[in-house]
């Protein structure tokens, strides 16, 4: 039952982290005019992945795509380039964990291969979660150390005298969604590799033989035999019968067609 | 680099109207997406903060501050890069400088910019 609810949670947590990282990843507020010491707010500029915002303080709003991909920082190529691979990513991570939920019973599939799938999705999203933060943060560290800002030039007085500022830009809506995101993705990833561990078989159990007896028409059915150094007791206080110890999570087996004379 | 030039600012009586006119030029490295108008009253001058007026984009979209509606009309002409802004019922509260701007996206860049004119003076006595 706990290892249930651990992949459940796992998987809910990973759906909803790799949601906000396609979010963050559409969003057009990555970073935005820092409007810190500069009175004249006639416009606020903001900017996304995919194209440059300018709201005018009068209620007018612009946006314009980077239409562009040479002109662009490799740092901006970049920052896209693992957004996306966290998408993609979260995307199979979360299309295989579907079939290894334990609640969703596809056919014959083993626990094993449920385990397996489990495993693997659960590797995907913490590899998905580390794209989309290492994103963020790649594009943070470019704003903290002004690595792209945009000179906006102000022209003021008269006989072309100009006055340069330097705009400065600050963290926008978008980093926070996606380091939140990114650690949530990373998370369920966690609790699904968790998860695995639970669903995987702990021994190996070796299926019980019949034997006949000469002599004798009785069938004798040893209980079943523990792969183990021969020290080992049932700590676990495990049923052993029917061809060996079966987990609580474990759903119920046909007899196999050694189990019978 | 675009410059902005304002004319029409002047002193007038309350109740009295003026044109104000600004032309940009040295535009053809840019694309001019918003222009307008902001003033500055009088107490601000200090701080430098400028509230808007009446802007237009290049589609004809308008937007005015609530405190002008019905008095101010902002007209554009695209092709020539202009910006008028008639003013009627003037009121003593009007009294400010009021600077034309253009907010615009220069050729290859990222982010847009804003220009400003010098400032034009205008004084409604009571």
């Known amino acids: 039952m706990a290892v249930t609810a651990c992949q459940g949670l796992g998987f809910v947590v990973s759906l909803i982290g790799i949601a906000g990282i396609i979010a963050a990843t559409c969003m057009d507020q990555w970073s935005t005019q820092d409007l810190y010491n500069n009175p004249v707010t006639a416009v606020f500029n903001y900017q996304g992945l995919w194209r440059s915002c300018v709201r005018e303080s009068s209620g007018f709003t612009e946006c314009r795509g980077y239409f562009t991909l040479l002109g662009l920082p490799a740092m901006l190529q970049a920052v896209r380039a693992l957004m996306i691979v966290g998408i993609v990513l979260g995307a199979i991570g979360l299309l295989v964990s579907i079939f290894a939920l334990k609640c969703i019973r596809i056919g014959s599939m083993e626990d094993s291969a449920k385990a397996n799938m489990t495993l693997t999705s659960g590797i995907m999203f913490i590899v998905s979660g580390l794209c989309a933060i290492a994103g963020v943060s790649v594009f943070a560290n470019m704003l903290v150390t002004n690595f792209w800002m945009s000179t906006a030039n102000m022209y003021t007085g008269m006989g072309g005298m100009v006055q340069t500022v330097q705009t400065r830009y600050t963290f926008g809506a978008a980093l926070f969604v996606g380091w939140v995101a990114g650690g949530l993705t990373l998370i369920g990833g966690v609790m699904m590799c968790i998860a695995c561990r639970g669903l995987a078989p702990e021994e190996t159990n070796y299926k019980a033989v019949s034997y006949h007896a000469s002599g004798h028409s009785v069938a004798y059915k040893p209980g079943g035999f523990k792969a183990s150094t021969g020290f080992g007791s049932n700590t676990k206080n495990k049923k052993i019968y029917d061809g060996g110890a079966r987990t609580e999570d474990e759903v119920q087996s046909y007899p196999s067609k050694h189990d019978y004379v | 680099q675009v410059k902005l030039e304002e004319s029409g600012g002047g002193l007038v009586q309350a109740g009295g109207s003026l044109r104000l006119s600004c032309a940009a030029s040295?535009?053809?490295?840019?694309?001019?997406?918003?222009m307008g108008w902001y003033r500055q009253p009088a107490g601000n001058q200090r701080n430098n903060q400028r509230e808007?007026?009446?802007?237009?984009?290049?589609?004809?979209?308008?937007n005015y501050a609530d405190s002008v509606k019905g008095r101010f009309t902002i007209s554009r002409d695209n092709a020539k890069n202009t910006v008028s802004l008639q003013m009627n019922s003037l009121k003593p509260e009007d009294t400010a400088l009021y600077y034309c701007t253009a907010v615009l996206w220069p050729r290859g860049a990222i982010s847009a910019m804003t220009v400003w004119g010098q400032g034009t003076q205008v004084t409604v006595s009571s």
């Open positions: 040295g535009s053809s490295n840019a694309d001019i997406r918003f």
């Open positions: 808007p007026v009446a802007m237009v984009d290049t589609t004809g979209r308008i």
